[in-house]
Interface confidence: low
């Protein structure tokens, strides 16, 4: 008769491990017992169980409650064992041992290997600035038995760099992501992809990129100065910008106090019915947590009398 | 064998801190994942956060980014540093821990009471 076995038995972490040994015997063979032991090099054996024809199963103390038999039917030619619950420590050797009736013993040895599926996690990088030059966005960690591969998954433009280091019984993998930041990048995904034998499918994590930024800051309200007369309703000015974090708002005017009447309104600053004295230099001051910008207009609200005067003086003077 | 012995619990206000304490009879080098469970009154006992030897972590979702888990194997003793506390954190926290030998063993700790409440 002969033995069948696997040269190598993989289970993730957690699963139950079956441990083969099939007796692929001759007719009227009878096996009397199967002991399995475990035979990492130069550590001797250790017994890990005992099938007996007569007196069943015996489970070293060392593996209580963790050994057992496969559900039946069960074959009586075969020595099967379930390992529950496969951790680390259990990766290595293994030998099972049939003694049979006539032939003999016969032993074969296989290899446990527990895979460690990673546990990534994702770190952000210092805050992202425009204007910084290649600045760490995010660093992904993933430790795991064999080593993870980690990668990255986004659109946006950047380098990686990898590093790994061997513990006793894993690996850890970090891998940084850096980039040169832009406000283009606000709000755009980093994906950390780890992929892993004893994973079913490649785990993700994902971080949104934020750039500090502040644009430049303009008003608007001035298109058309002719709409800027004495008596007219509704006039206001717009400070325009925009930045991450949303921006804040001020206005100031650089020639005095602010007209009585006027009102600030966040970026807009709204006027009563205009008069002369609502004419001079405006100012919005746009700031964040980032950065601070100004932006400065001439407001000169025109007399129609004075201008029609004129008019009627050149007229006259033809 | 392993003792694993729990300390820090107590009463704390909603929004508050505390740092639970699990020391190991024996040297913590050769347990190769330390961890916390919680047991609230009338619940199972829930998985709260684990640490490797070489110092990696994972955390439940209910507790990432409140709780912090570490280790000083040079003291033997495992940590929970707990922030922004709730209600629901209230449970009896225990500490478990992994021996690395050929039948692997897990130990566990009597557990401390952390009791969140205004």
């Known amino acids: 008769g002969e033995l069948e076995t696997s040269d190598v038995v993989t289970v993730v972490l957690g699963q139950d491990a079956k441990l083969p040994c099939f007796y692929r015997g001759d007719s009227g063979e009878q096996v009397g017992q199967v002991a399995w032991a475990r035979v990492d090099a130069g550590e001797g054996a250790q017994e890990l169980a005992l099938l007996h024809s007569k007196y069943g199963l015996h489970v070293s103390p060392a593996y209580e409650g963790r050994v057992e038999q496969p559900p039946p039917p069960r074959n009586p030619l075969d020595g099967s064992v379930l390992l529950r619950n496969a951790v680390q420590a259990d990766e290595g050797e293994y030998e099972c041992r049939v003694s049979t009736f006539p032939a003999g013993s016969f032993q074969a040895r296989l290899r446990l290997r527990v895979l460690v599926p990673p546990l990534p996690s994702l770190n952000p990088g210092p805050a992202l600035e425009e204007g910084q030059g290649l600045t760490l966005a995010a660093s992904c960690t993933a430790e795991g038995s064999p080593a993870p591969s980690v990668t990255w998954d986004t659109e946006v433009k950047g380098t990686t760099s990898s590093r790994s280091f061997k513990h006793s019984r894993s690996a850890a993998v970090t891998s940084e992501f850096h980039l040169v930041p832009s406000r283009s990048m606000n709000g755009q995904p980093l994906t950390c992809v780890v992929s892993h034998p004893g994973l079913l499918q490649d785990q993700r994590i994902t971080h949104i990129l934020h750039v500090s930024f502040l644009a430049e800051a303009s008003v608007r309200g001035l298109e058309d100065q002719n709409l800027w007369h004495i008596g007219r309703e509704g006039a206001m000015l717009k400070c325009l910008s925009e930045g991450q974090p949303p921006p804040s708002y001020n206005w100031t005017r650089l020639d005095g106090p602010l007209p009585s009447g006027v009102r600030v309104d966040g970026d807009t600053l709204g006027f009563p019915p205009l008069t002369t004295e609502h004419s001079g230099i405006y100012v919005c001051h746009v700031s964040n947590e980032f950065s601070s910008r100004d932006s400065q207009v001439t407001v000169d609200v025109l007399d129609p009398q004075e201008d029609s005067g004129k008019q009627v003086d050149l007229v006259s003077a033809s | 064998e392993v003792q694993l012995v729990e300390s820090g619990g107590g009463l704390v206000q909603p929004g508050g801190s505390l740092r639970l304490s699990c020391a190991a009879s024996?040297?913590?080098?050769?347990?190769?994942?330390m961890g916390w469970y919680r047991q609230a009154p009338g619940k199972q006992r829930e998985y709260v956060a684990t640490?490797?030897?070489?110092?990696?972590?994972n955390y439940a979702d209910s507790v990432r980014g409140r709780f912090t888990i570490s280790r000083d194997n040079s003291k033997n003793t495992l940590y929970l540093q707990m922030n922004s506390l709730r209600a629901e954190d209230t449970a009896v926290y225990y500490c478990?821990?992994?021996?690395?030998?050929?039948?692997?063993?897990?130990?566990w700790g009597r557990g401390t009471l952390v009791t969140v409440s205004s």
């Open positions: 640490i490797t030897t070489g110092g990696s972590t």
């Open positions: 478990t821990a992994e021996l690395v030998r050929r039948g692997p063993t897990t130990y």
């Open positions: 024996r040297s913590t080098f050769s347990l190769n994942i």
